[in-house]
Amino acid sequence: QRLPRMQEDSPLGGGSSGEDDPLGEEDLPSEEDSPREEDPPGEEDLPGEEDLPGEEDLPEVKPKSEEEGSLKLEDLPTVEAPGDPQEPQNNAHRDKEGDDQSHWRYGGDPPWPRVSPACAGRFQSPVDIRPQLAAFCPALRPLELLGFQLPPLPELRLRNNGHSVQLTLPPGLEMALGPGREYRALQLHLHWGAAGRPGSEHTVEGHRFPAEIHVVHLSTAFARVDEALGRPGGLAVLAAFLEEGPEENSAYEQLLSRLEEIAEEGSETQVPGLDISALLPSDFSRYFQYEGSLTTPPCAQGVIWTVFNQTVMLSAKQLHTLSDTLWGPGDSRLQLNFRATQPLNGRVIEASFPAGVDSSPRAAEPVQLNSCLAAGD
């Protein structure tokens, strides 16, 4: 499903990825156009009754009729009953010798809060982004990336870890969310769906995109990841939606062309260094930001999420390669590796641009604008 363009917002600068689909409110379909994509049913990290989203968390949308081809529950992977969301929250990274975070999967046992109690926390990720409810924060300046253009050597480790494809990044990739908010990149990985089924983790007004890239960063205030886990701002993730476009994305092809080599779960290969920034949208000035969690166990909270307004374009063939090449645990395809969207529970998503300003027909409706928390100060 593609988002119809109502009022195109040209990106700043020409991105090498050829992406040109911003996510401002003006580009979102009306409620009639946009059914909420179904999340995996009965997922183990579903909120308890006390965590059920309020009106501000979920878009009011009309369910699509079956004739319109809505995604049915029986089409999705079966999962076990939800785990007990009452377990105490614990953001601490468990010691490697203890109950590690490797024994989990999308759907089924064990329930994620049993793997890591933090997965039952109140401020989890991913979330549904409603641009009209985002607080415009002029203090959110354009992101700064330094050292992301890597030389071919040394090569980088690309691994099928059974949950995603992950590229480990070398030291020296610096990212700033703003003055005094400095990070270094650790790794990037992707989330995707299956044939005809989108698989982004975040959604926009209930719309799920074909795929999503996450670049995970560690705050320079911490020497080690385990020190930063669960600490506010200890980790930061840059996220961008991947959409279908007419042309092959040459930056992504450098990775996608190697997936066949790591089709088997646990397999890994070396890839030449590349321009990591070319995997992201070109417009670093327009984004949404909120505090959430890792989207997989240990689900540690305090993670600063920055979701680009602009999307990245891949060809249909490339999106198919991404979703149809890798294998996961138990001889099953590695597909639909996204977590259900989690309730905001009062969190306000901030925007670096006036995302709620709308000239589409919906502007006639009352617009609720949240106030900026000035997180960028």
């Epitope: 010798e97 975070q101 040394p154 480990t168 088997e264 646990g266 397999s267």
Partner: antibody, heavy 122, light 107 residues
Amino acid sequence: QVQLQESGPGLVKPSETLSLTCTVSGGSISSYYWSWIRQPPGKGLEWIGYIYYSGSTNYNPSLKSRVTISVDTSKNQFSLKLSSVTAADTAVYYCARRGYDFLTGYDYFDYWGQGTLVTVSS
Amino acid sequence: DIQMTQSPSSVSASVGDRVTITCRASQGISSWLAWFQQKPGKAPKLLIYAASSLQSGVPSRFSGSGSGTDFTLTISSLQPEDFATYYCQQANSFPITFGQGTRLEIK
């Protein structure tokens, strides 16, 4: 606490196949990489290869034609077979777990067996 | 294969001394470097991984630094139990390779 224990014959004849098993206790063999590393007497360490719990393998090219590593998740064991051995294969053989930092992607040999000396001699 | 060269091959030091062992890779290995301690008749013990991350349970007197081709293991104040052989190991590319070892002896 994860523990690894190598077992197998301490003496193998030249041209025969060396067979060792590593039993993992105190933790599951699932979701990790399991390696074999050897150390000739008085010398340094040489990586032989690894197997992922699902069966994916990677071998040292210098030994690849003679090495097979397999895993039995039901027994929490993995095994090494080295064919056509010579005296140069005499070494202490260690099994080790190759841990994996889920966030950074970096890995490391964090748990080792105590090692077993295998002598190749007629 | 990536060659790992340690220096010195052996070093004599006293309890309380600060000791530095270096490891050089024949080509860039980013931060894919680990340091091990091995005592006679025992298996190697992981001290440092990812060039500078201290393994759980390892005393803080051990530290690692470097990236690319040049790496350092530092023991800030030698203790009697630190006399052993130390190995560096790269995991940037296969095959995984080890340095030849540095023997730390009592002066």
